[in-house]
């Protein structure tokens, strides 16, 4: 008899987009509407929750903009939290200082992306230093990953 | 008898590089010479044409530069067009304003990359706001994807 | 009799982080401690050495910062060297000019990432123009790849 058909495993993948009702850190994300993807990974209170240990490519982009440049330092972090560890682990980070001309309308993006070995129950989050300067358009601010 | 050797499917992948004879939008790309890759995906009039539905990581970098900064707003978009939909869908976008000192020679890059669920016959393109400010060196300006 | 269990091939992957004792080009990397990954790829004198021909996604981020901006041109390159070729091949590059306000403390990142067809024995390196302006925190400056 021929072997049973191979069970095609669902790809573990997420692509979440900016959600403008984020009021505090970590950033919250749109996980339902638009160009969102969420498969084999859970979304909980701003975080992507890993349910299978392995190698993942993790990425995020944040779009900062303002009307009267004051050059407040900007930071954009992807960090990991796991109940086994007391402290958050910053996986990737981008910082900007002195990036625009005083008083001018300005806009700038930060992009992060890299490979990490993640463990089941790891929670991944995105943090920014100046929430009021983030624009949450779905094409501009996003957070995602996929299992290699 | 031993089973027939497994047929190794060709990876669906593209990496196209800047083509300086781009005269209008969308940007056109070098699809033949240099560090170019094109396998299982077609290139047509500036666009990458998907021929198999699935999850893809899509990326692009554009290198902007000028001789005398006047801070024209810069935008860099990856968008999708499909005959089934009336309107282009902006998948990823980067914008820059107030990014250099007036009158100075300047240079800046925009990088975009994320995962999307693409459908057979989707056409992907790259658009920029200021074509005259783009440098098309193959290492500096590129557009690519691969099927997960 | 049932077939022998399938041998799960180790994923070819690397994620190296900034090493502050880099004194010259190419940059050197931390390959042992912290959030480092190195599997199926070798690290040798700043370079990632490919041992299996194929398609790879290669990425790097470099974090530049300074105490008093004088707008020195910054460049960040990922390049490839192979004994069969006389010259280095620049795969990806980012350049910045006129990016901060003279005399101010400043900070800026450059991110690169794309797909390449690499050959066994290819050596991949990262080069920057101003080593003294690079910050080597593991979350800020890194270099990695994975085989598709």
């Amino acid at each position: 008899p021929s072997p049973p058909p191979e069970k095609k495993e669902l790809r573990k993948v997420a692509h979440l987009t900016g959600k403008s009702n984020s009021r505090s850190m970590p950033l919250e994300w749109e996980d339902t509407y638009g160009i969102v993807l969420l498969s084999g990974v859970k979304y909980k209170k701003g975080g992507l929750v890993i349910n299978e240990t392995g190698l993942y490519f993790v990425y995020s982009k944040v779009y900062f903009r303002g009307q009267s440049c004051n050059n407040l330092p900007l930071s954009h972090k992807v960090y990991m939290r796991n109940s086994k560890y007391p402290q958050d682990l910053v996986m990737m980070e981008g910082k900007m200082m002195s990036y625009c001309t005083t008083g001018q309308m300005w806009a700038r993006s930060s992009y992060l992306g890299a490979v990490f070995n993640l463990t089941s129950a790891d929670h991944l989050y995105v943090n920014v230093s100046e929430l009021s300067l983030v624009n949450f358009e779905e094409s501009q601010t996003f957070f995602g990953l996929y299992k290699l | 008898p031993s089973p027939p050797p497994e047929k190794k499917e060709l990876r669906k992948v593209a990496h196209l590089t800047g083509k300086s004879n781009s005269r209008s939008m969308p940007l056109e790309w070098e699809d033949t010479y240099g560090i170019v890759l094109l396998s299982g995906v077609k290139y047509k009039k500036g666009g990458l044409v998907i021929n198999e539905t699935g999850l893809y990581f899509v990326y692009s970098k554009v290198y902007f530069r000028g001789q005398s900064c006047n801070n024209l707003p810069l935008s860099h978009k990856v968008y999708m067009r499909n005959s089934k939909y009336p309107q282009d869908l902006v998948m990823m976008e980067g914008k820059m304003m107030s990014y250099c000192t007036t009158g100075q020679m300047w240079a800046r890059s925009s990088y975009l990359g994320a995962v999307f669920n693409l459908t057979s016959a989707d056409h992907l393109y790259v658009n920029v706001s200021e074509l005259s400010l783009v440098n098309f060196e193959e290492s500096q300006t590129f557009f690519g994807l691969y099927k997960l | 009799p049932s077939p022998p269990p399938e041998k799960k091939e180790l994923r070819k992957v690397a994620h190296l982080t900034g090493k502050s004792n880099s004194r010259s080009m190419p940059l050197e990397w931390e390959d042992t401690y912290g959030i480092v990954l190195l599997s199926g790829v070798k690290y040798k004198k700043g370079g990632l050495v490919i041992n299996e021909t194929g398609l790879y996604f290669v990425y790097s981020k470099v974090y530049f910062r300074g105490q008093s901006c004088n707008n020195l041109p910054l460049s960040h390159k990922v390049y490839m060297r192979n004994s069969k070729y006389p010259q280095d091949l620049v795969m990806m590059e980012g350049k910045m000019m006129s990016y901060c306000t003279t005399g101010q403390m400043w900070a800026r990142s450059s991110y690169l990432g794309a797909v390449f067809n690499l050959t066994s024995a290819d050596h991949l390196y990262v080069n920057v123009s101003e080593l003294s302006l690079v910050n080597f925190e593991e979350s800020q400056t890194f270099f990695g790849l994975y085989k598709l």
């Epitope: 009307q67 407040l72 005083t102 008083g103 001018q104 309308m105 300067l133 | - | -």
Partner: antibody
């Protein structure tokens, strides 16, 4: 509550300099740029320039470049605007106003400082 | 620089009536879906007070009888039913780029 309190009225001779102060309170001073606007008697409003309260550098209206100098003292949450080589047409009320980077306009203004230039 | 032109220079209206003030910019003050046009009210001996930002948004604490409209180069401030405290000078101002510029003002007086 948010307040921008400016220094008192000044009378100056032509050719002299004047330095007007603007002290912010009731908010995080370094989160907002400070703009300076003047108004000659019976005339409209004229934008002079803006200073980054965080970084300390300024952008000026071309008309005042070389004569106006904007500075900030973060320790006292105070912005300053100095105008040199004064002439009679510089007689005006000088206002400071804060501008939130994430918003669209100058939302709070100082009460104004009258500078009179007369020989 | 962008030149702002207000009209009329003076507008005489009776209390309870509607007032419509106009402002034209020498070039578009729109960018990326927003109009960078603001309106201020100034009374004698006082600092200007922000009424409307981004062409049509009412500043916190400003009565709902004030409204703004327009885009591109043409903008309008409307006061639906004039109260005695509304008689003042009104300025439009763009914040699209530096230098910011103001209109010359419209004086709203009691008819």
């Amino acid at each position: 509550q948010v307040q921008l309190v400016q220094s008192g009225a000044e009378v100056k001779k032509p050719g002299a300099s004047v330095k007007v102060s603007c002290k912010g309170s009731g908010y995080t001073f370094t989160d907002y740029t400070i703009h300076w606007v003047r108004q000659a008697p019976g005339q409209g409003l004229e934008w002079m320039g803006v200073i980054s309260t965080y970084q300390g550098d300024a952008s000026y209206n071309q008309k005042f470049k070389g004569r106006a100098t904007m500075t900030v003292d973060k320790s006292t949450s105070t912005a300053y605007m100095e105008l040199s080589s004064l002439r009679s047409e510089d007689t005006a009320v000088y206002y400071c106003a804060r501008f939130p980077d994430w918003d669209y306009a100058m939302d709070y203004w100082g009460q104004g400082t009258l500078v009179t230039v007369s020989s | 620089e962008i030149v702002m032109t207000q009209s009329p220079a003076t507008l005489s209206v009776s209390p309870g009536e509607r007032a419509t003030l106009s402002c034209k910019a020498s070039q578009s003050v729109d960018y990326d879906g927003d109009s960078y046009m603001n309106w201020y009210q100034q009374k004698p001996g006082q600092a200007p007070r922000l009424l409307i930002y981004a062409a049509s948004n009412l500043e916190s604490g400003i009565p709902a009888r004030f409204s703004g409209s327009g885009s591109g180069t043409e903008f309008t401030l409307t006061i639906s039913s004039l109260q005695s405290e509304d008689f003042a000078v009104y300025y439009c101002q763009h914040s699209r780029e530096l230098p910011y510029t103001f209109g010359q003002g419209t004086k709203l007086e009691i008819k």
